[in-house]
């Protein structure tokens, strides 16, 4: 079994700062296709009172809108409740706060359950280093390699980053 970096040793505060989205995966491909509800891109994160606050970039009408979301802590380790396009059980599946973060969400919307995973990195130049870990985690939680979309610079709302 590989190392299980599922919780930042120094607490959630270590996740604060800038992040870059690298890859998405879902069992419902429409969710992560262009204009899909979960084809969104991380800009930055912060933590307060055990909750995670994220600024995400959402492509809209040829531009990218920055939206702030809060994922609230629960009584389960590394699990948060997030309201975004329905209810999401958001899990920190694997974390190395200085390098990469893999999120896993179980989305429930209109009696439909979907899975979405998200790989983000601190340094885009190292994104290839963490794709194998993302593929492994995806397989482990029930997503397949062919359900992964690796994002390009054009996808990521790079022009919207301050």
């Amino acid at each position: 079994q590989e190392g299980n970096h599922e919780e930042p040793q120094g607490g959630l505060e270590e996740l604060s700062g800038r992040w870059h989205s690298v890859a998405l995966a879902s069992n419902k491909s429409d969710l992560i296709k262009p204009w899909g509800h979960f084809r969104v891109f991380i800009h930055s994160m912060s933590a307060k009172d055990g909750n995670l606050h994220g600024d995400i970039l959402i492509p809209q009408d040829g531009q990218c809108e920055k939206v702030s979301l809060t994922a609230f802590k629960t009584a389960t380790s590394n699990k948060f409740d997030l309201e975004y396009w329905g209810h999401n059980d958001l899990y920190l599946a694997e974390v190395d706060p200085k390098s990469y973060l893999i999120l896993y969400m179980i989305n429930q919307y209109n009696d439909d359950t979907s899975l979405v995973a998200h790989l983000m990195v601190r340094d885009l130049s190292r994104q290839q280093d963490f794709l194998p870990a993302f593929e492994s985690v995806c397989e482990d939680i029930g997503l397949h390699k062919d359900q992964i979309v690796v994002l390009s610079d054009d996808d990521r709302c790079q022009g919207s980053r301050d």
Partner: nanobody
Framework: AVQLVDSGGGLVQPGGSLRLSCAAS????????MGWFRQALGKEREFVAA????????NYADSVKGRFTISRDNAKNTVYLQMNSLKPEDTAIYYC?????????????????WGQGTQVTVSS
């Protein structure tokens, strides 16, 4: 579906340890996410711990984190719950659960096979 048989429960003093086992038969065990839940008398079923297919991803209830460890041996078709520093409030029937669709974490609705349960009593 997979069949699950829980074992390892018993009476233990506060501060003691137990290891629960859940043996699976049926489909390939490595396809299954596994979870442990518990239910104390007169209370609702409560999440304890869960493991993804290889154990790469795990989650724990805050109330047991640092005391309980979930692990699995896919070669032996078995998932374990090592329980240390047991407290009277850990007294309950413990159930293992499995699902071959995806990792459902702490939500019992996302598990479609359940064991019969094993009683754990922590008392002096």
């Amino acid at each position: 579906a997979v069949q699950l048989v829980d074992s390892g429960g018993g009476l233990v003093q506060p501060g003691g340890s137990l290891r629960l086992s859940c043996a699976a038969s049926g489909r390939t065990f490595s396809y299954y996410a596994m979870g442990w839940f518990r239910q104390a008398l007169g209370k609702e079923r409560e999440f304890v711990a869960a493991s993804s297919r290889t154990g790469r991803v795990t989650n724990y209830a805050d109330s047991v984190k640092g005391r309980f460890t979930i692990s699995r041996d896919n070669a032996k078709n078995t998932v374990y719950l090592q329980m240390n520093s047991l407290k009277p409030e850990d007294t309950a029937i413990y159930y293992c659960a499995a699902d071959d669709r995806f990792y459902g974490g702490d939500n019992p609705a996302f598990y479609n096979s359940w064991g019969q349960g094993t009683q754990v009593t922590v008392s002096s």
